[in-house]
Amino acid sequence: WELTILHTNDVHSRLEQTSEDSSKCVNASRCMGGVARLFTKVQQIRRAEPNVLLLDAGDQYQGTIWFTVYKGAEVAHFMNALRYDAMALGNHEFDNGVEGLIEPLLKEAKFPILSANIKAKGPLASQISGLYLPYKVLPVGDEVVGIVGYTSKETPFLSNPGTNLVFEDEITALQPEVDKLKTLNVNKIIALGHSGFETDKLIAQKVRGVDVVVGGHSNTFLYTGNPPSKEVPAGKYPFIVTSDDGRKVPVVQAYAFGKYLGYLKIEFDERGNVISSHGNPILLNSSIPEDPSIKADINKWRIKLDNYSTQELGKTIVYLDGSSQSCRFRECNMGNLICDAMINNNLRHADEMFWNHVSMCILNGGGIRSPIDERNNGTITWENLAAVLPFGGTFDLVQLKGSTLKKAFEHSVHRYGQSTGEFLQVGGIHVVYDLSRKPGDRVVKLDVLCTKCRVPSYDPLKMDEIYKVILPNFLANGGDGFQMIKDELLRHDSGDQDINVVSTYISKMKVIYPAVEGRIKFS
């Protein structure tokens, strides 16, 4: 019996087609992805093949103005239109709290939404009961297939799930649910979830009875043969893991942003064992037509976005200096504003020992592309912020050793004075440079804000300590020459859309007046 699994993950509100790098589509003839194009390809495959499942491995939420405005209603609407068969909850599905998941998505989705390792307690337990499930048994042709969901156990540090959801260890939570499916005589089981490729592989290895793992979170690109675009494969598609009980378990992921549609063909024997598996992600490039009816619907929904862009988010009573003359040479108040917003967006009261799990921010000055003049009645709009942060990136959470941070700050000024983009703006960090010293030895003082303290204060950076830092995904990926970050990071979790982080902060503060306050000094 053959099953075709079509899968997406980490779409991050890319409902419209995008450029090849998943930013805003500029030249339509070169654009990719988007739900209208995805629908065309899905319909083609459904038409051609008998047993097809369309699955999403989480993180539909967060990433463009679509999510900012529609808050998840767009996800439910268009996933319903595409007739998804199931979705796993990702960490970003909790970005607007549990209410922001329940109302727009859980109550509106016409497909099951899954996670076996999220357990509700207290008053939430009854409110959310039945709105998401640990697993779902789906009829496919003459057979049944069990889908069991999972979500990153790090979600409380990455999003806002509140205090009434417990995120258990994935493997521990999955095994009893898979066992339950087995007792229901379901012998074909897919683990669909959002914990990253390393955890996906562990699930394939450790959870008895899982036949296929469809993952997300790490934006992993797998491909067999010559890859069709810029993404470099992390391995073959499917990636085969030998389980502890000796089975060959295919593990797949389909990069991110709706650029590819994962296509996996599985052949099962009559006892539900995987005989063979093959496939590849399908690049959704512009040679695949956008479905006119879905496209028309997108255009209808778009109207509200255009109106939103020009509405006031808040006011500034000071000039927001985002000029390259400032931000690439010295501390600039736009950099301070953005870093403060980044930390504010990551406030998660961890426990009595820590006032927060992260206190530090770094931001390449070259990523700040425009100032905002306060003389326009102080008004700040999304449109203004899009000029400051035009690249559609994310502000991510990483873990780095102190020694890596020191290297990053040395890199920040290694060729100081040439108006290059690597000069770092900061939050929760006090740095002093001595430019008379040779490159690679210019950082004379580097103090960082404590997290394990009731009254935050600045302490010298410790080389062997592991620190959490918020930074742009551009830096996490080694951009602007920060190869040491990419090479030495110990953990990387993708965060929220950059503009969204700053706009939320400004809306919350209502009136802002960031200053230049001595975060960066020259001796």
Epitope: S287, P289, E290, D291, P292
Partner: antibody, heavy 121, light 107 residues
Framework: QVQLQQSGAELARPGASVKLSCRAS????????LSWVKQRTGQGLEWIGE????????YYNEKFKGKATLTADKSSSTAYMELRSLTSEDSAVYFC??????????????WGQGTTLTVSS | DIVMTQSHKFMSTSVGDRVSITCKAS??????VAWYQQKPGQSPKLLIY???YRYNGVPDRFTGSGSGTDFTFTISSVQAEDLAVYYC?????????FGGGTKLEIK
């Protein structure tokens, strides 16, 4: 290399049936669709229907329902089209053509050489 | 059914000329349009798919453009071997339909 080899010319009586064949080679037969196209002498092209050999799913032009039946034999990588209740209107060249539904080339990328059917008493 | 209309049944041109053939769909077909060349006694050959993508090995003098309902096929510099009938076809909805064809004649 990809080839679609069609059966030879057919002469048939009105009211009879014929079965045309299209043997595929050079690619995985079950991973593509196969369409059949009719062309009367000096006329344009008309799509009859398509079959997906992997699933056996068939789709027909309403105009040819009851006239044409599409089948495929996976073991020999051969697609067939049976035409029944033949009339002189069925006299034409019939092409099979491949369709890559997993790729992005929206069109028929390989065609057979065509089979000429003549219906005459 | 979607009707594909090629307004010119015949077009006369000279070697080296630029020639454009138009095709109009009766409803929005996005970019799901292919163009074929058929020479006498031969099967059709795919030249352009998805409205503007040149198929493997097709000379770059052949181009396609358009989306929605209006499509154009262009030969930038006609060669003697381009004498043929050219068909547009929509691949958006079944039944897939072809235009009536445009016969390119060399003066």
């Amino acid at each position: 290399q990809v080839q679609l080899q069609q059966s030879g010319a057919e002469l048939a009586r009105p009211g009879a049936s014929v079965k045309l064949s299209c043997r595929a080679s050079g690619y995985t037969f079950t991973s593509y669709g196969l369409s059949w196209v009719k062309q009367r002498t000096g006329q344009g092209l008309e799509w009859i229907g398509e079959i997906y050999p992997g699933s056996g799913n068939t789709y027909y032009n309403e105009k040819f329902k009851g006239k044409a039946t599409l089948t495929a034999d996976k073991s020999s990588s051969t697609a067939y089209m049976e035409l029944r209740s033949l009339t002189s209107e069925d006299s034409a060249v019939y092409f099979c053509a491949r369709y890559d539904y997993l790729g992005s080339s929206y069109g028929f990328d390989y065609w057979g050489q065509g089979t000429t059917l003549t219906v005459s008493s | 059914d979607i009707v594909m209309t090629q307004s010119h049944k015949f077009m006369s041109t000279s070697v080296g000329d630029r020639v454009s053939i138009t095709c109009k769909a009766s409803q929005d077909v996005s970019t799901a349009v292919a163009w074929y060349q058929q020479k006498p006694g031969q099967s059709p050959k795919l030249l352009i798919y998805s409205a503007s993508y040149r198929y493997n090995g097709v000379p770059d003098r052949f181009t396609g453009s358009g989306s929605g309902t209006d499509f154009t096929f262009t030969i930038s510099s006609v060669q003697a071997e381009d004498l043929a009938v050219y068909y547009c076809q929509q691949h958006y909805n079944t039944p897939y339909t072809f235009g009536g064809g445009t016969k390119l004649e060399i003066k």
